[in-house]
């Protein structure tokens, strides 16, 4: 399914404290498959991969094609 990389943005929407680490929420949302179609505005966000929207954070993330890495799947994985 390729590499999953999350955009650095976390809106903090489900976090009580703005500086709270949302990693637990993110992990849980990934485990439960809490993703939706990326909004149209992010159609071209992922360069070499597909976009999905992290419901818990209301932010785009990219699932990279094989051989690509980076928040937007913009870099070739030299170790691939």
């Amino acid at each position: 399914d390729g590499n999953s990389t999350r955009s650095p943005e976390t809106n903090g929407l489900l976090c009580g404290d703005p500086e709270e680490n949302c990693a637990a929420t993110t992990t849980q949302s990934k485990r439960k498959g809490h993703f939706s179609r990326c909004p149209k505005q992010y159609k071209h966000y992922c360069i070499k991969g597909r976009c999905r929207f992290v419901v818990a954070e209301q932010t785009p993330s990219c699932v990279c094609d094989e051989g690509y890495i980076g928040a937007r799947c913009e870099r070739v994985d030299l170790f691939y």
């Epitope: 650095p8 943005e9 903090g12 703005p18 939706s36 505005q41 209301q58 932010t59 937007r72």
Partner: antibody, heavy 116, light 106 residues
Framework: QVQLLESGGGLVQPGGSLRLSCAAS????????ISWVRQAPGKGLEWVSH????????SYADSVKGRFTISRDNSKNTLYLQMNSLRAEDTAVYYC?????????WGQGTLVTVSS | DIQMTQSPSSLSASVGDRVTITCRAS??????LGWYQQKPGKAPKLLIY???SLQSGVPSRFSGSGSGTDFTLTISSLQPEDFATYYC????????FGQGTKVEIK
């Protein structure tokens, strides 16, 4: 606590330029998308632009495309909006807001008046 | 561009009233919708995201519903601090706001 503080507003003539700044504190600025949203006097809200955390993804409203440029300096925890070829209809309070799609924290705004 | 139309533009209500504001998108936006409250001279405050999820710290008397093109913000029992202007915002195709609904004291 999260704080966003805009500055740089003022009176400018049509066709002129202005650069707004937004100083952020109370959160890890470099992890978040940030946006500019404006509000003309007595009017509603209008999204202007957003920028991702790494400065490699930006989008603009059609009304400002080609005239405004959003940028950020993560080392200074600061967001910028360079506004060129200003028009009377750009007169508004300009807010910076945390987020790219939704805006969970806002600054107090800075007033930009474009008039001769 | 997606246009967002709110109704009514203004309404008068009393403390304790149930208030409903509607927002219609010119095309389907799934559930990519937020609601904000703004008081005079202040910045907007996020109330609801993803059409129906309550933002942290927002009182439970606020609720949102809808999907596709038709959305609703409901205040179950209006409180004195709720008199303000409310905006919907879609974030499917870029970001656009409704024109606002002013909730005034009857």
């Amino acid at each position: 606590q999260v704080q966003l503080l805009e500055s740089g507003g003022g009176l400018v003539q049509p066709g002129g330029s202005l650069r707004l700044s937004c100083a952020a504190s109370g959160f890890t600025f470099s992890r978040y998308w940030i946006s500019w949203v404006r509000q003309a006097p007595g009017k509603g809200l209008e999204w202007v632009s957003h920028i991702d955390s790494n400065s490699d993804w930006t989008s603009y409203a059609d009304s400002v495309k080609g005239r405004f440029t959003i940028s950020r300096d993560n080392s200074k925890n600061t967001l910028y909006l360079q506004m060129n070829s200003l028009r009377a209809e750009d007169t508004a309070v300009y807010y910076c807001a945390r987020g790219g799609s939704l805006f969970d924290y806002w600054g107090q705004g800075t007033l930009v008046t474009v008039s001769s | 561009d997606i246009q967002m139309t709110q109704s009514p533009s203004s309404l008068s209500a009393s403390v304790g009233d149930r208030v409903t504001i509607t927002c219609r998108a010119s095309q389907g936006i799934i559930s990519y919708l937020g609601w904000y409250q703004q008081k005079p001279g202040k910045a907007p405050k996020l109330l609801i995201y993803a059409a129906s999820s309550l933002q942290s710290g927002v009182p439970s008397r606020f609720s949102g519903s809808g999907s596709g093109t038709d959305f609703t913000l409901t205040i179950s029992s209006l409180q004195p601090e709720d008199f303000a202007t409310y905006y919907c915002q879609q974030y499917d195709a870029l970001n656009t706001f409704g024109q606002g609904t002013k909730v005034e004291i009857k």
